[in-house]
Amino acid sequence: LEASEEVELEPCLAPSLEQQEQELTVALGQPVRLCCGRAERGGHWYKEGSRLAPAGRVRGWRGRLEIASFLPEDAGRYLCLARGSMIVLQNLTLITGDSLTSSNDDEDPKSHRDPSNRHSYPQQAPYWTHPQRMEKKLHAVPAGNTVKFRCPAAGNPTPTIRWLKDGQAFHGENRIGGIRLRHQHWSLVMESVVPSDRGTYTCLVENAVGSIRYNYLLDVLERSPHRPILQAGLPANTTAVVGSDVELLCKVYSDAQPHIQWLKHIVINGSSFGADGFPYVQVLKTADINSSEVEVLYLRNVSAEDAGEYTCLAGNSIGLSYQSAWLTVLPEEDPTWTAAAPEARYTD
């Protein structure tokens, strides 16, 4: 083994949400570079509970664990936690092997890449390639809707995927309408769900090296009268320049015929609220859901006076729902303005 040869985990994608513990044997003096997540949102590396600094002989940097030259004290347990969520992306133990100067006739093939084929990948247990797309564990959907579960994965050799329902092999043969399995998309699709579809759905991803699994919970909601449901995040907070046009969007879902109003919050005699505790508002637009484009509020040629809080109010025979957003209007010459609006906020 040449001294320049490195221990690497590749490709550099975010691995499993339920990462299997790995052991890697590393020769003394050998450089190590282990990957954890994509560079722009990579994880942070910790050894025995302490975060690795971004500089030094052993460093955690932009999602990589780098050891310039492996020493006995570098052996131990290393964890990579996803930025912001503390989800374990990598969980591995580095074990000290023979030094680089010793014979390597019977070296562990898992410990490094074959120098005669520098572009071959080592065998690798399955891992999730897009764990962020799997964060929604509980799916509560109305009866009649379509449900799609995805478990995108990779590994070497390429793993296979199979599905379980409540712990039993699931092929959909007893399900009216059946199921669609799209192995190339690592997905399970069920159309027109009914209450009997409720349960725990497990994707099981396997190859010769190992297996990983992930559970989704499906709850099917039987349709019942309810007040209108407004799509989360709409209307969205918006920033605009004086003179520009603005569209505020409100998505309304309702079994019963809904009635929609767009309101602007106003101030009267220096107060935003009346004696009854309700806000002062001006009705800008009102219509039934089947009126054209009632779910969009158009504001043309906005001025500073248009800034403020706007509310989409939807009502039906059962009750009312509303969500609000803020419009910020900047002067034309403001050089700090960017088109990126902040995240939507909404009332409950």
Partner: antibody
Framework: QVQLVETGGGVVQPGTSLRLSCAGS????????MHWVRQAPGKGLEWMAL????????FYADSVKGRFTISRDNSKNTLYLQMNSLRAEDTAVYYC????????????WGQGTM | DIQLTQSPSSLSASVGDRVTITCQAS??????LNWYQQKPGKAPKLLIY???NLEIGVPSRFSGSGSGTDFTFTISSLQPEDIATYYC?????????FGGGTKLDIK
């Protein structure tokens, strides 16, 4: 309903030990990372320790490393904090907390134990 | 370790006022910053997560913005029930850390 309830607080002498417990209910305790946060009288919040759902991955603030041990029993839905070599400056309200949203924000807190 | 500097440490405002609190991180933490409200004798309550997302059930007068090292928390129209201490907290990496807090009261 989702809740965390801490117990085990009390008055002790410097140099002695105390164990706090935190019982979780209404959520899947075994899938959640659990934290301890403390607040000295009239002071701000201080993060102290985290234990991941595997029960073996622990992380500590420097101020308590080596003296405090976080642990959990998923079969009992309970989190623990073993506090040894206690000092006067450890006087505080101790909260257990978790992130049900999975995004690192503490969206569930216990009521605290002194 | 990441330090969070919160300012001001205390603040008096009138009902209906727009209130702004800032939080500065000692290094880039992307958008991994949360804001909490704590009333005397109570546990903290999450208001804003990931810099700008309003926690479910929190009134829309509360908002947050910022990314990298500089963050802002705003109450658009102060209400009497908003009297409390407010804390920022980073969850980019461990050890987690909180700002020193901002005590807000009514003039």
């Amino acid at each position: 309903q989702v809740q965390l309830v801490e117990t085990g607080g009390g008055v002790v002498q410097p140099g002695t030990s105390l164990r706090l417990s935190c019982a979780g209910s209404g959520f899947t305790f075994s899938e959640s990372g659990m934290h301890w946060v403390r607040q000295a009288p009239g002071k701000g919040l201080e993060w102290m320790a985290l234990i991941l759902n595997d029960g073996i991955s622990n992380f500590y603030a420097d101020s308590v490393k080596g003296r405090f041990t976080i642990s959990r029993d998923n079969s009992k839905n309970t989190l623990y904090l073993q506090m040894n070599s206690l000092r006067a400056e450890d006087t505080a309200v101790y909260y257990c907390a978790s992130s049900l949203g999975g995004n690192g924000a503490f969206d569930i807190w216990g009521q605290g134990t002194m | 370790d990441i330090q969070l500097t919160q300012s001001p440490s205390s603040l008096s405002a009138s009902v209906g006022d727009r209130v702004t609190i800032t939080c500065q991180a000692s290094q880039d933490i992307s958008n991994y910053l949360n804001w909490y409200q704590q009333k005397p004798g109570k546990a903290p309550k999450l208001l804003i997560y990931d810099a700008s997302n309003l926690e479910i059930g929190v009134p829309s007068r509360f908002s947050g913005s910022g990314s990298g090292t500089d963050f802002t928390f705003t109450i658009s129209s102060l209400q009497p029930e908003d009297i409390a201490t407010y804390y920022c907290q980073q969850h980019d990496n461990l050890p987690l850390s909180f700002g020193g807090g901002t005590k807000l009261d009514i003039k």
